[in-house]
């Protein structure tokens, strides 16, 4: 027989919950890495590429040791929502130009969405305060040219890769402390 009616459901082991989040993040990191390699191969673009609308990287070199789970999850979720929006924008704005990357970009968007739902679930399971819904972000301006769009793609994927690498580091460390 299950628990008596009205009794709270036993909450899942937070380590296991965090573990599955780490695995999803690592999987998305690999997808992003592969897509970045393809982008560099098909649309080479030297140098660093920036996009002002992208989130700034959430960490400095020395910050990993001081991370706390609530702040990591909150920041990661906010940053990934921004990257999801940018990937959607990229697919809409650059549909024809990035056709060769389209199946992979679509998969990336789906998996990014899945990770965001997993983060939301983890935050509720850990009884972390839920953030108020984000105010609607101003629409992203279409790229001024095909080349501008390609540079934006480099910036988006490069930034997402770094964010996910940072996230895996932080989550792995935090898991050992739970």
């Amino acid at each position: 027989p299950g628990p008596p009616p009205g009794s709270p459901r036993a909450s899942p082991d937070p380590r296991a919950e965090l573990d599955s989040t780490v695995l999803l993040t690592r999987s998305l990191l690999e997808d992003t890495r592969q897509l970045t390699i393809q982008l560099k191969d098909k649309f080479p673009a030297d140098g660093d590429h920036n996009l002002d609308s992208l989130p700034t990287l959430a960490m400095s070199a020395g910050a990993l040791g001081a991370l706390q789970l609530p702040s990591v999850l909150t920041r990661l979720r906010a940053d990934l929502l921004s990257y999801l929006r940018h990937v959607q924008w990229l697919r809409r704005a650059m549909g024809s130009s990035l056709k060769t990357l389209e199946p992979e970009l679509g998969t990336l968007q789906t998996r990014l969405d899945r990770l965001l739902r997993r983060l939301q679930l983890l935050m509720s399971r850990l009884a972390l305060p839920q953030l108020p819904p984000d105010p609607p972000a101003p629409p992203l301006a279409p790229p001024s040219s095909t080349w501008g769009g390609i540079r934006a793609a480099h910036a988006i994927l490069g930034g997402l890769h770094l964010t996910l690498d940072w996230a895996v580091r932080g989550l792995l460390l935090l898991k050992t402390r739970l």
Partner: antibody, heavy 119, light 111 residues
Framework: EVQLVQSGAEVKKPGASVKISCKAS????????MDWVKQAPGQRLEWIGD????????IYNQKFTGRATLTVDKSASTAYMELSSLRSEDTAVYYC????????????WGQGTTVTVSS | DIVLTQSPASLALSPGERATLSCRAS??????????IHWYQQKPGQAPRLLIY???NLESGVPARFSGSGSGTDFTLTISSLEEEDFATYYC?????????FGQGTKLEIK
Amino acid sequence: EVQLVQSGAEVKKPGASVKISCKASGYTFTDYNMDWVKQAPGQRLEWIGDINPTIGAPIYNQKFTGRATLTVDKSASTAYMELSSLRSEDTAVYYCARGELAHWYFDVWGQGTTVTVSS
Amino acid sequence: DIVLTQSPASLALSPGERATLSCRASKSVSTEGYSYIHWYQQKPGQAPRLLIYLASNLESGVPARFSGSGSGTDFTLTISSLEEEDFATYYCQHSRDLPPTFGQGTKLEIK
């Protein structure tokens, strides 16, 4: 050709520090992380830590936290590992190896740097 | 930490024979999609060399006589027909969690 070239052998006294370098060539340094692995005589290989060259963010094996410091010089495509408060058990060959956190295997290795700690 | 135990500790075989090396993890290192086990070969005075990644993927440039299999906690490296240059020490490594750890090695010797 993708290569990692490490600095030469070191002999140190107990309590001293050692800093080993690892110069990468043949690939874009910031596209991969750099890991460090210890191999003491007769012991299994032991992972020390990993650093992302772009953000300079290291993670460490708890066993080495506080004594190992991983850094990079992006402009020179070089990674460094410093080990402080040396003791005899630190006598080993230290390797740098190219890795990435998604799957975390090491596909390119340096030739190794022998560190001997002896009074 | 996840502990990897390799067996046998040493194995004496002749060129042309088949070698089967085992690696057992103290907890599962597989997830949906991946088995986080990798195999390396090391010769005296040399650095390890990656042979197999993610349990069964052959690293570029590694001869096809090497293959990997397994999932969960039990993994195998097979060398279908030994060549002179295959006599070395073999290590498995997991990357399922922090920290990644290595097995103690299996030394493959000429009979």
